[in-house]
Interface confidence: low
């Protein structure tokens, strides 16, 4: 057999036995002659150095460049490859010799004690136990212990080769402490030497640098970088660092194993790089590489070295932030600086503290922005070493998509008396104000009653054929008033009104307001009835604990069977062709109420009394009447709002005043509450009595003292009282100057 590439000028050495494999018996003599074209050498098993005493290599007597290898009384251990080669070349001829020794079928190692096999617990890796055979066709199995297990070649991943040994997936014997090969010859068992199994790990799970990023120092400071490698068990790790200034004299490297919890399936290694006093040349990329032999993992971090501490705002720092109500707003403080600055946020000059709605840190986060968050936010950066300060102002503008105030107040099914003039209102609050408010309409019957147009509980108007109010053909005559602007509850609102000249047909009206961040709409069910009429006695909006009556009046000649109901909270599941308006269709959503009937000359009147009205009494009340002729049911709906009782409060303070004799004092005391409180004034804790100089106006809200005198000086108290209690504010009026003598004196 030939090894290597033939050269142009040299033929391969030629062996006297022209075979790849030679099988001879033990105790016989092995002799092979090798001839070539230049100086030759022999290599043989077990002793590659050529100093084996049993082996004799002699020059041939009959020619140059010829050597004969002779081994008398060969033994099984002489099995192996015999190689004749030209010195200092790759050109060689090889013959594999099996010395059949049935008493010792395995070739013993040099030490003849035991061998070591190193394995990794990798599913895909195989290991070779080098139990070579002196016989090529042995039946060899592998024994592993403890516990004892035997592995037999399976023609696949488990195999034995006399020239190589026993091959087996490494994980199969990773449990074992030792293994050996066993051959059966004529019912006799022969064993190879023992091989100790050493499980060697290789897997590195990760390499972590700490600090991992954003490392900044100034010249002269100490840099400490920790590199931690986490590995599987039975792993050894070599660390290697790469860094900018490799000739650093103050560099120190310490490697050590870290303790892990007992039973842990992992090992930890730590390498610490320390540079005592960094210079600008130490700035750059630091890379830590951990190697287990079979695997290398790296991690890098950039170290920035500054000449001295500093702080400045980054170029991306915003000056205007726009947001829509409800959004999460994030205003990052973008800065350049070392060390990281202390960051303090202020709103309109007042420091901001973090709470559940706002987080004031590197990033100012407002969880759900509201209008009151509008304003100027100042961020102040302070360098903790140099105390240098930098400030920047960010204006936050919060936009509000159109909100229609009446949307939550008006009943979705109010009814209107036939022929009356009605005004529908949409009060819109939006920032910026709406750039338009448009009105649309459509006939009530167009919006439903088609089986294919079934409505749903949460969207009672699935109609899409809205018409502009300019086109009121077939509907009610309409006029849209010019938008008004009003300050309502301290907010600038846009009020759009639609006047229906005569309520002739039932329709739906929709106002739609649009601004730059959104749209809002309100659908008004304008259900026109010729039927009964509802009035409230004594007041449109009763306060808690007051009594109120709902009067349902119907023409006796037209209607009968008047009944009061209250609209319940659980609507019907809507099926084909059903509509929530008119309410009459869904009587099962109504609760029948007790009422009192009496009559006048033309009408039947059904009165429903609410004694001591409570907030639970709020809701939609339905009066049902039946047409005497057609038996058709007519419904009228009225929404009842019960005002909550509120104890008196006085808005604004009375200010202490200093006034000169003869001047006038005018003060006002505005009180709110439900029921509305009575206002009284006191001077020095005594009721203030009106006279020519003391005037009380607007239900005692405004106090005027004309041509003040010295005796008007004192403590003035405004007190607002109702059944729910009193509220008061006080102020001291000082009167300066001398009292002029009057003629009377």
């Amino acid at each position: 057999a030939s090894v290597g590439l033939p050269s142009v000028s040299l033929d391969l050495p030629r062996l006297s036995i022209q075979k790849d494999i030679l099988t001879i018996k033990a105790n016989t003599t092995l002799q092979i002659t090798c001839r070539g074209q230049r100086d030759l050498d022999w290599l043989w098993p077990n002793n590659q150095s050529g100093s084996e005493q049993r082996v004799e290599v002699t020059e041939c007597s009959d020619g140059l460049f010829c050597k004969t290898l002779t081994i008398p009384k060969v033994i099984g251990n002489d099995t192996g490859a015999y190689k004749c080669f030209y010195r200092e070349t790759d050109l060689a001829s090889v013959i594999y010799v099996y010395v059949q020794d049935y008493r010792s079928p395995f070739i013993a190692s040099v030490s003849d004690q035991h061998g070591v096999v190193y394995i990794t617990e990798n599913k895909n890796k195989t290991v070779v136990i080098p139990c070579l055979g002196s016989i090529s066709n042995l039946n060899v199995s592998l024994c592993a212990r403890y516990p004892e297990k035997r592995f037999v070649p399976d023609g696949n991943r488990i195999s034995w080769d006399s020239k190589k040994g026993f091959t087996i997936p490494s994980y199969m014997i990773s449990y074992a402490g030792m293994v050996f090969c066993e051959a059966k010859i004529n019912d006799e068992s022969y064993q190879s030497i023992m091989y100790i199994v050493v499980v060697v790990g290789y897997r590195i799970y990760d390499v972590v640098l700490s600090p991992s990023h954003g490392i900044e120092l100034s010249v002269g400071e100490k840099l400490v970088l920790n590199c931690t490698a986490r590995t599987e068990l039975n792993v050894g790790i070599d660390f290697n660092w790469e860094y900018p200034s490799s000739k650093h004299q103050h560099k120190k490297l310490v490697n050590r194993d870290l303790k892990t919890q007992s039973g842990s399936e992992m090992k930890k290694f730590l390498s610490t790089l320390t540079i005592d006093g960094v210079t600008r040349s130490d700035q750059g990329l630091y890379t830590c590489a951990a190697s287990s032999g079979l695997m290398t993992k790296k991690n890098s971090t950039f170290v920035r070295v500054h000449e001295k501490p500093f702080v400045a705002f980054g170029s991306g720092m915003e000056s205007l932030v726009e947001a829509t109500v409800g959004e999460r707003v994030r205003i990052p403080a973008k800065y350049l600086g070392y060390p990281p600055p202390e960051i303090k946020w202020y709103k309109n000059g007042i420091p901001l503290e973090s709470n559940h709605t706002i987080k004031a840190g590197h990033v100012l986060t407002i969880m759900e922005v509201s209008e009151r968050d509008t304003g100027n936010y100042t961020v102040i950066l302070t360098n903790p070493i140099s105390k240098e300060k930098q400030s920047h102002v960010v204006s936050l503008v919060v936009y509000v998509p159109p909100q229609i105030g009446e949307k939550s107040l008006i009943s979705p099914v109010d009814s209107y008396q036939y022929g009356t003039t009605q005004t529908l209102t949409c009060t819109v609050y939006a920032i910026p104000p709406p750039h338009h408010i448009h009105w649309y309409w459509q006939l009530e019957e167009e919006c439903a009653n088609e089986p294919s147009q079934a409505v749903s509980v949460t969207n009672p108007y699935p109609c899409e054929e809205w018409r502009s109010v300019e086109d009121f053909q077939g509907g009610n005559k309409i006029e849209v008033n010019k938008n008004q602007f009003a300050l309502i509850e301290g907010k600038n609102k846009t009020v759009s009104t639609l006047v229906i000249q005569a309520a002739n047909v039932s329709a739906l009206y929709k106002c739609e307001a649009v601004n730059k961040v959104g749209r809002g709409e309100r659908v008004i069910s304008f259900h026109v009835t010729r039927g009964p009429e509802i009035t409230l006695q004594p007041d449109m909006q009763p306060t808690e604990q007051e009594s109120v009556s709902l009067w349902c009046t119907a023409d006796r000649s037209t209607f009968e069977n008047l009944t009061w109901y209250k609209l319940g909270p659980q609507p019907l599941p809507i099926h084909v062709g059903e509509l929530p308006t008119p309410v009459c269709k869904n009587l099962d959503t109504l609760w029948k109420l007790n009422a009192t009937m009496f009559s006048n000359s033309t009408n039947d009147i059904l009165i429903m009394e609410l004694k001591n009205a409570s907030l639970q009494d709020q809701g939609d009340y339905v009066c049902l009447a039946q047409d005497r002729k057609t038996k058709k049911r007519h419904c009228v709906v009225r929404q009842l709002t019960v005002l909550e009782r509120v104890a008196p409060t006085i808005t604004g303070n009375l200010e202490n005043q200093t006034t000169s004799i003869g001047e006038s004092i005018e003060v006002s005391c505005t009180a709110s509450g439900n029921p509305p409180p009575q206002i009284m004034w006191f001077k020095d804790n005594e009721t203030l009595v009106e006279d020519s100089g003391i005037v009380l106006k607007d239900g005692n809200r405004n106090l005027t003292i004309r041509r003040v005198r010295k005796e008007d000086e004192g403590l003035y108290t405004c007190q607002a009282c109702s059944v729910l209690g009193c509220a008061k504010v006080e102020a001291f009026f000082i009167i300066e100057g001398a009292q002029e003598k009057t003629n009377l004196e």
Partner: antibody
């Protein structure tokens, strides 16, 4: 044209679970109440469950409460029925219906060991 | 046991008329004008024929009509045709805990 297509039926062992889906098209899904109705082999129609357009109002047949859950995803125009602890008597063709005016072709659920 | 009672089967010859009844209580058929009728051919999905007692969806022949008296609703089919052979189910809104209830179904055979 209104189209309702059920899917998710199949063979399941007693005690097992299935999730039926109904893909809707050809109408404004988010405006309509939706229903599941079933029909056991050779038997009549049995109302199973209803859900309003915004999922605010949900109703189940008394015999199924606690085992079946109806839900919908208006963004995906889809109706669902999650069926747990299935029994042999739940074997049926399950129909999805829009307000009982439009029906799908049904999906067969077989509960058998 | 269905809450609404229907005859199991009815039959008539082509051209004749037939009426299918659906009996409930004051909590369902008698209490609400929400009675519907469905036609179902074998292997097919049900089809709405009548809603709210007597209303016909577009596309349904005027040979089909619905009515109600007290607690009983009726479906009438005039001028019977072979394609009318099918199962017919009634349903009603009900004020019990389940809002919908079906009848047991009636098999209509056209002789």
């Amino acid at each position: 044209e209104v189209q309702l297509v059920e899917s998710g039926g199949g063979l399941v062992k007693p005690g097992g679970s299935l999730r039926l889906s109904c893909a809707a098209s050809g109408f404004t899904f988010s405006s309509y109440s939706m229903n599941w109705v079933r029909q056991a082999p050779g038997k009549g129609l049995e109302w199973v469950s209803s859900i309003s357009s915004g999922s605010s109002y949900i109703y189940y047949a008394d015999s199924l409460k606690g085992r079946f859950t109806i839900s919908r995803d208006n963004a995906k125009n889809s109706l669902y029925l999650q069926m747990n602890s299935l029994r042999a008597e739940d074997t049926a063709v399950y129909y999805c219906a829009r307000d009982f005016g439009n029906w799908g072709q049904g999906t067969l659920v077989t509960v058998s060991s | 046991q269905s809450a609404l009672t229907q005859p199991r089967s009815v039959s008539a010859s082509p051209g004749q008329s037939v009426t299918i009844s659906c009996t409930g209580t004051s909590s369902d058929v008698g209490g609400y004008d929400y009675v519907s009728w469905y036609q179902q051919h074998p292997g097919k999905a049900p089809k709405l024929m009548i809603y709210e007692v007597s209303n016909r969806p577009s596309g349904v022949s005027n040979r089909f009509s619905g009515s109600k008296s007290g607690n009983t609703a009726s479906l009438s089919i005039s001028g019977l045709q072979a394609e009318d052979e099918a199962d017919y189910y009634c349903s009603s809104y009900t004020s019990t805990s389940s809002p919908v209830v079906f009848g047991g179904g009636t098999k209509l055979t056209v002789l």
